[in-house]
């Protein structure tokens, strides 16, 4: 790669590197999102005692957050690359409505919440390029998502705080499982 013109000693181009592979870039993207989730969790846990609460089951009834199961082929036992990739993409698409819900839930981390949402969209694009069997991926129904969003936003303050905490925790767990599975692909 040509060094750009007009270089001076304090402003030199980075050394030439091997281009990023699809797997490397997806790995970095997931870690980027996980760092974002950590930043958001920090604000959530500082603002309320949700992170230590034992009443999670009350809020969890309202949520249908994506989870990895044995049948999804993402665990070491019964690992199936194609089935797992479909599950990861489908799960991320299902999380999008919950990430939309998070957008108005943060005061000092508004920009970070937006970054997590947008970087998830990018991750989905990267993974869709990798997937061979795109027909097997079911996209959530927009009408169902819209009514879910309305329902979540109508909850009382305590439930909204708990929902925020649960979304972040579940999303973190889903991404961690995805990261482990993708490293086997």
């Amino acid at each position: 790669a040509p060094v750009p013109p007009g270089e001076d000693s304090k402003d030199v181009a980075a050394p030439h590197r091997q281009p990023l592979t699809s797997s490397e870039r997806i790995d970095k993207q997931i870690r980027y999102i996980l760092d974002g989730i950590s930043a958001l969790r920090k604000e959530t846990c500082n603002k309320s005692n949700m992170c230590e609460s034992s009443k999670e089951a009350l809020a969890e009834n309202n949520l249908n957050l994506p989870k990895m199961a044995e049948k999804d082929g993402c665990f070491q036992s019964g690992f199936n690359e194609e089935t797992c990739l479909v599950k990861i993409i489908t799960g991320l698409l299902e999380f999008e409505v919950y990430l939309e819900y998070l957008q108005n839930r943060f005061e000092s981390s508004e920009e970070q919440a937006r970054a997590v949402q947008m970087s998830t969209k990018v991750l989905i694009q990267f993974l869709q390029k990798k997937a061979k069997n795109l027909d097997a991926i079911t996209t959530p129904d927009p009408t169902t998502n819209a009514s879910l969003l309305t329902k979540l936003q109508a909850q009382n303050q305590w439930l909204q705080d708990m929902t925020t905490h649960l979304i972040l925790r579940s999303f973190k767990e889903f991404l961690q499982s995805s990261l482990r599975a993708l490293r086997q692909m």
Epitope: A13, P19, S22, Y32, A39, Q112, M118, F126
Partner: nanobody
Framework: QLQLVESGGGLVQPGGSLGLSCAAS????????IGWFRQAPGKEREGVAC????????YYADSVKGRFTISRDNAKDTVYLQMNSLKPEDTAVYYC????????????????????????WGQGTQVTVSS
């Protein structure tokens, strides 16, 4: 061979518009943060705009804010710089560059206009604003 290719430069009248494109060969542009730089004769190179690959956020130098728009189409693996309300002082060779400045959450967006953040550079396309 790994290279970036800019296109869309040309001669335009003051107040006019021009759209530049940046494409890559030998690697995937969608995986990199992209910056547009420019260099006028006898002047130092300056970063004008950049766009993240991680969260698609953008940054603009004050000199082009409100007039230039950077965007990317990951499906086409192309980055664009739409330039409106062009002024004679926008005359320069425009370069696109690809780097990994955006892979850490919480990166400082304004750093993206520093050339040391970039690994790959194009050969440039001439933009002339004159009546």
């Amino acid at each position: 061979q790994l290279q970036l290719v800019e296109s869309g430069g040309g001669l335009v009248q003051p107040g006019g518009s021009l759209g530049l494109s940046c494409a890559a060969s030998g690697f995937t542009l969608a995986y990199y943060g992209i910056g547009w730089f420019r260099q006028a004769p006898g002047k130092e190179r300056e970063g004008v705009a950049c766009i993240s690959s991680s969260d698609l956020s953008t940054y603009y130098a004050d000199s082009v804010k409100g007039r230039f728009t950077i965007s990317r189409d990951n499906a086409k693996d192309t980055v664009y710089l739409q330039m409106n309300s062009l002024k004679p002082e926008d005359t320069a060779v425009y370069y696109c560059a690809a780097g990994t400045w955006d892979l850490k959450f919480g990166y400082s967006r304004s750093n993206c206009v520093r050339s040391y953040e970039y690994d790959y550079w194009g050969q440039g396309t001439q933009v002339t604003v004159s009546s």
